[in-house]
């Protein structure tokens, strides 16, 4: 028998520095977690102790903190090289700055193979990107070879900016011939490494003949066997065992997100490459693991540029940006409008001639807007200003919801109106009218939404049975501020870009902004 140790990360999202337990900015260092310096300590410890070790990343290193905003992927290549990753799969967020924003900082600089079997380049891009990412790689480990085959969510064109010269194929259809090739090369130990979410990971384990292990990402799935060491609630045991269609037991793993855990899976193979046993658990990277001093010093060196960036002007406002709780928790506020407009603008994807855009709606809990911005400072807006407005380090995500769920969400928005509570929704691409004289749960009297399948966008009444795409904070997608109906009833959830980054990009693009209060949210006569 031959034993392989797979160390894995996914959805690190720019958390190069240690973070608090909830993966936001580290405040009390003695209770902070993760970060590349701490990760390196643990990886090196395992490499020294065990003979056959692979360090793999399942995508979405890009996007999530000011590190990505400033360094645009160069930080990912630099620190992944320093940690000596063996391979990485492309995630959807790796395309956030377009194909060029992937090629130059990451693909050309990474000292490890970057993989995806279901992304096919065409046109002029085909020769430009040739060899910079691969469908699979055969890695030598000890006296054996291990095949790693990559995959990426086929929804990427709706979630990011891959352009028109990359085709995202069905994962299973694309993976099978590549796995067959590996088998033809006498490679009998094969890992599928990719970024399509836990449901697809399980399908790959079930359907792709020859895959021995699946290491996934995208859905931030936490798996654990035994008592979990932190706040994350396991979605199943680690590894999650899937019985393939040809009767094999295939371990499937994922390691939550944000570099909080290091996935640790031990696989035993027989001489024919069959998995005999698999066991392990994610390792919580808490403060009991010291940060590696040389990596930490490097982080501190790179950090300097971030501090300078946060005080630079992004753009100007010529109006007061009202982000006060007195406004945003009671009525339409122009800060809410600005943020929602930025959220929609960030998700412009012309992927179908029938649609002017794939999504037109935004909702945003008023309690998530934490500060106004005064225009009487020469109109200057900095990253620092935006960090006061959006201090929680969240993301603006894409969900699919039925009209009936949206209606419930808007009823929840005003179910206890007047108490300055955070659930009051700010909107974009939505016109809502409330009648507060009616009883809670029956206060939405008009709810019109902006069409997407139209050449001239206009507002139509919400249809209860129709499925709509909506951009919203991850906080709401996870049921925060009492929006349990969103969490329970959402049909799809894809994590998006860092909230501050979305707004800062929009302001930089617009240069001068002047958001108004324009009647998106109304109260019917006599009720307010």
């Amino acid at each position: 028998a031959w034993e392989l140790t797979i160390l894995h990360t996914n959805d690190v999202h720019s958390r190069l520095e240690q973070t608090s337990e909830d993966s936001s900015k580290c405040v009390n260092a003695s209770r902070c977690m993760g970060g590349v310096a701490r990760l390196f300590t643990k990886v090196q410890q395992i490499r020294r102790a065990e003979p056959n070790v692979l360090l793999l990343d399942a995508g979405d290193q890009y996007q999530g903190t000011i590190w990505f905003t400033v360094y645009k992927g160069a930080e990912v290549a630099h620190f992944m090289n320093a940690l000596r990753y063996d391979a990485m799969a492309l995630g959807n967020h790796e395309f956030d700055n377009g194909v060029e924003g992937l090629i130059e900082p990451l693909l050309k600089e990474a000292k490890f193979p970057i993989l995806s079997a279901n992304i096919k380049a065409k046109g002029p891009l085909a020769s430009q990107i040739s060899g910079l990412y691969l469908p699979y790689k055969v890695l030598p480990v000890g006296d054996e070879v291990v095949g790693i085959v990559g995959y990426t969510s086929k929804e990427t064109p709706f979630l990011s900016n891959p352009g028109t010269n990359l085709v995202f194929e069905d994962e299973i259809t694309a993976l099978q011939p590549e796995v067959d090739k590996l088998k033809t090369l006498n490679v009998n130990k094969i890992i599928a490494l990719g970024h399509s979410g836990f449901e697809m990971d399980k399908l790959i384990a079930q359907k792709v003949r020859g895959v021995d292990v699946v290491v996934g990402g995208h859905s931030n799935t936490f798996l654990y066997t035994g008592n979990p060491p932190s706040k994350e609630v396991p979605a199943g045991k680690y590894p999650f065992i899937v019985t393939s269609d040809d009767g094999r037991k295939v371990p499937v793993v994922q390691a939550y997100a944000f570099g909080k855990y290091l996935g640790y899976l031990k696989i035993e193979f027989d001489e024919r490459g069959n998995v005999i046993s698999s066991h392990g658990n994610p390792i919580l990277l808490n403060s009991s693991i010291p940060e590696d001093p040389s990596i930490k010093a490097d982080i501190n060196k790179w950090r300097i540029k971030l501090d300078n960036y946060s005080t630079q002007e992004l753009g100007k406002t010529i109006v007061y940006l009202d982000g006060s709780s007195q406004s945003c928790r009671f009525r339409e506020c122009n800060m809410g409008n600005l943020i929602c407009d930025a959220m929609i603008n960030n998700n412009l994807r012309h992927t179908d001639e029938m649609f002017w855009n794939h999504v037109s709606m935004c909702i945003l809990n008023g309690g998530g807007i934490r500060s106004p911005i005064d225009e009487r400072n020469n109109g200057t807006i900095t990253w620092e200003n935006l960090a006061a407005v959006l201090p929680f380090g969240g993301t603006f995500d894409l969900v699919q919801l039925k009209g009936s769920t949206l209606k419930k969400a808007f009823e929840h928005s005003v179910h206890r109106y007047g108490q300055s509570t955070g659930e009051f929704l700010q909107v974009g691409g939505i016109h809502v009218v409330y009648d507060l004289s009616r009883k809670p749960g029956d206060r939405v009297v008009k709810l019109d939404v902006l069409c997407t399948k139209c050449r001239v966008p206009s507002y139509d009444p919400l249809k209860m049975d129709e499925v709509y795409k909506v951009i919203l904070p991850n906080f709401l997608a996870n049921g925060g501020d009492g929006f349990q109906m969103i969490k329970d009833e959402l049909l799809r959830h894809d994590s998006g870009d860092q909230d501050i980054n979305v707004v800062s990009t929009y302001i930089s693009k617009m240069k001068v902004i002047y958001p108004a209060v324009e009647g998106r949210i109304k109260f019917s006569t006599g009720s307010h």
Epitope: D86, K108, K111, P113, V138, L139, T184, L185
Partner: antibody, heavy 118, light 107 residues
Framework: QVQLVQSGAEVKKPGASVKVSCKAS????????IYWVRQAPGQRLEWIGW????????KYNEKFKGRSTLTADKSASTAYMELSSLRSEDTAVYYC???????????WGQGTLVTVSS | DIQMTQSPSSLSASVGDRVTITCKAS??????VAWYQQKPGKAPKLLIY???TRHTGVPSRFSGSGSGTDHTLTISSLQPEDFATYYC?????????FGQGTKLEIK
């Protein structure tokens, strides 16, 4: 463009050692195998072994195990092949080559002639 | 080790001819066969891998076929620059092995 540039011709006495270098450029050195292949006069090509610069893993053809040493200097993007206890039948052109994606040889160095003669 | 045997060892042909070179493996190598062209004093050049996939920049007159133990390289219409020695290689398992070569000469 991918280039592999090898060191110059060598003449060695039986029992001596030779070290041939292969300087890579035009791609990320750590991401592809470097293979060593030799060709004795009028003979077929013979695979000596590989080194994978990413993790410095080495695999030898059993025939060359013990006499051949493959190394790589990542910072210089250079691979080396040393052959010891040379005999006259080791007279050959030694090539380094790079894979496309494992097991076939897509790009070749220009070759280094090693002559073993007393 | 897998032995690769090429035939013929040499052959003479004219410009415009269709030429076929065969390679027999001592055991099943599936479709894991590559073909190389070598000219005197030069390094070999990859023509084909995976039995029938042409390497970048290789003219379409070169094609490969076969599976299992029997593999073939075909040049559909010989050009003056095609006169050289051709080698097959199995990339199925280590040690990777080559055929003894087929020398293609001008008739």
């Amino acid at each position: 463009q991918v280039q592999l540039v090898q060191s110059g011709a060598e003449v060695k006495k039986p029992g001596a050692s030779v070290k041939v270098s292969c300087k890579a450029s035009g791609y990320t050195f750590t991401n592809y195998y470097i293979y060593w292949v030799r060709q004795a006069p009028g003979q077929r090509l013979e695979w000596i072994g590989w080194i994978y610069p990413g993790n410095l893993n080495i695999k030898y053809n059993e025939k060359f195990k013990g006499r051949s040493t493959l190394t790589a200097d990542k910072s210089a993007s250079t691979a080396y092949m040393e052959l010891s206890s040379l005999r006259s039948e080791d007279t050959a052109v030694y090539y380094c080559a790079r894979d496309d994606n494992y097991a076939w040889f897509a790009y070749w160095g220009q070759g280094t002639l090693v002559t073993v003669s007393s | 080790d897998i032995q690769m045997t090429q035939s013929p060892s040499s052959l003479s042909a004219s410009v415009g001819d269709r030429v076929t070179i065969t390679c027999k493996a001592s055991q099943d190598v599936s479709t894991a066969v590559a073909w190389y062209q070598q000219k005197p004093g030069k390094a070999p050049k990859l023509l084909i891998y995976w039995t029938n996939t042409r390497h970048t920049g290789v003219p379409s007159r070169f094609s490969g076929s076969g599976s299992g133990t029997d593999h073939t390289l075909t040049i559909s219409s010989l050009q003056p620059e095609d006169f050289a020695t051709y080698y097959c290689q199995q990339h199925y398992s280590t040690p990777f092995t080559f055929g003894q070569g087929t020398k293609l000469e001008i008739k």
